[in-house]
Amino acid sequence: TQHGIRLPLRSGLGGAPLGLRLPRETDEEPEEPGRRGSFVEMVDNLRGKSGQGYYVEMTVGSPPQTLNILVDTGSSNFAVGAAPHPFLHRYYQRQLSSTYRDLRKGVYVPYTQGKWEGELGTDLVSIPHGPNVTVRANIAAITESDKFFINGSNWEGILGLAYAEIARPDDSLEPFFDSLVKQTHVPNLFSLQLCGAGFPLNQSEVLASVGGSMIIGGIDHSLYTGSLWYTPIRREWYYEVIIVRVEINGQDLKMDCKEYNYDKSIVDSGTTNLRLPKKVFEAAVKSIKAASSTEKFPDGFWLGEQLVCWQAGTTPWNIFPVISLYLMGEVTNQSFRITILPQQYLRPVEDVATSQDDCYKFAISQSSTGTVMGAVIMEGFYVVFDRARKRIGFAVSACHVHDEFRTAAVEGPFVTLDMEDCGYNIPQTDESTLMT
């Protein structure tokens, strides 16, 4: 996981701060007992902002120690600061917990930029604004880190919600969500509604604001409109999916669909941007540039280096295209599309020097590790991680930022052939052939 472009901190306001809250539409599929309905105690349990991550409050140990924990669907370790650090307001003090058990094993996690390392143990963990359960979970107590914690952030750890295959040091370390499902009656599913603010938030606004919801064990009707559409989880490691087509303002990028998933496509709440493989990024930028050519933006804007600004309240959203990703559907030869607006891929940035204007950063960037559907995508949708049925659901988020002319959309079905060919098969090192 590339910590450099990956998130770490906080998000917008609940509801539809700037944007019109969409009306409820008709009911979707038949009810599934225990899997949907109202989860009032979990609604609005996330805070943060898209540029620095979304966090949930958790308690660890006995007596409970409260920590803010970054919600990350792109990793699989539950890891918390466990030693003083200049950027941490508080940290997990194992010696104060009567239920802490040392696993006498270390863990080291390097990123492209930076790293964290620590000691493995288990302890009792609960989520105050989550299901009313306590579980014994693996915890990596971070004792040393470099470029991991963020100055001025409000979180002290990370909750990796992906699968055991990518857990460190190896896949024998059971991730938190697996422990939760095994030890309780919580269904094997969670859903995320990340609410981008649509405008920059200062520190005090962030701390006082709501950033969305993590519904553990179910689906909350109030958080989305229209229907939920599901795409298969291709492989249980990251939350890997298959993109079969990409359109900019309805114009097909016309690339071999393997390029869209080279070397994988994942849904990752721990990444800010929509990250695209080099070739796809270049084609997408070319197309977005062409669509928005009524204004001349600096090259640095497309690189994420320069901001673009407009006089407050005059952002010309209409000159920017919508972006549609077609995802493999659950039925053979059927796909559906998710469509985001510039309100999702232009990220509001507060800059004192230009405070009289509304300024934005282009939040689509280049990747060397495949497509990453980060907060930029997720802020448009209510995303259901249905692990039990090995699928991810998308519906239009009730809190997504939009204008009076366009909204994000989830639409289908579309007929798409040979979708299996769109998946890239990462070459596996056959260790059995290595000399020992």
Partner: antibody, heavy 116, light 107 residues
């Protein structure tokens, strides 16, 4: 308050290297790119290159490739520029400047004098 | 590389006058031009971005205009503290380039 605090004056020998620093404060360091600009005595401004602190991606002016190397330390919020194989042509004031729209914030500058 | 030309190297004005500093780009840079003021022995100070937007805290005596290839910084009601070098910069494409500067002297 946003500040870019640069390291002090350097008097260096020809052929050697020097590493200048620029410590940022008052904003999230990894959110904005850092640029370096050269100004020779009584002359104009020349863009050297830039670095993205979040990914350590760099982009150099062709004229400074091989001369300047840009790095960052995100844990301390500091950007660095190393200048190598110094000659009298490298005697100048070097500024770091933060991205935004153009360069809204500038450091106070570091004077480098190359002399034997 | 885009060349930014400030044809006037020096300008001399009296307090209260209006002065126009011009800058010409060798190719179309849209409105992606900034202006900086540099007083003797100091670092550059940002004045104008996007050709005509004032940075926060810049007095409204400073006005930018232009697009494409021709840009102007106008200082009305010139004050003695405006004694400085003024540089234009294009940030439309890499490498970013600056004009050679115009020195404003106060009579």
């Amino acid at each position: 308050e946003i500040q870019l605090q640069q390291s002090g004056t350097e008097l260096v020998r020809p052929g050697t290297s020097v590493k200048l620093s620029c410590k940022a404060s008052g904003y999230t360091f990894t959110n904005y790119w850092m640029h370096w600009v050269k100004q020779r005595p009584g002359q104009g401004l020349e863009w050297i290159g830039m670095i993205d602190p979040s990914a350590a991606y760099t982009n150099y002016n062709q004229n400074f490739k091989g001369k300047a190397t840009l790095t960052v330390d995100t844990s301390s919020g500091t950007a660095y520029m190393q200048l190598s194989s110094l000659t009298s042509e490298d005697s100048a004031v070097y500024y770091c400047a933060r991205s935004g729209v153009a360069f809204p914030y500038w450091g106070q500058g570091t004077t480098v004098t190359v002399s034997s | 590389d885009i060349v930014m030309t400030q044809s006037q190297k020096f300008m001399s004005k009296s307090v209260g006058d209006t002065v126009s500093v011009t800058c010409k780009a060798s190719q179309d840079v849209g409105r992606n031009v900034a202006w900086y003021q540099q007083k003797s022995g100091q670092s550059p100070k940002s004045l104008i971005y996007s050709a005509s937007h004032r940075y926060s805290g810049v007095p409204d005596r400073f006005t930018g205009s232009g697009s494409g290839t021709d840009f102007t910084l106008t200082i009305s009601n010139v004050q003695s503290e405006d004694l400085a070098d003024y540089f234009c910069q294009q940030y439309n494409s890499y490498p970013y380039t600056f004009g050679g500067g115009t020195r404003l002297e106060i009579k």
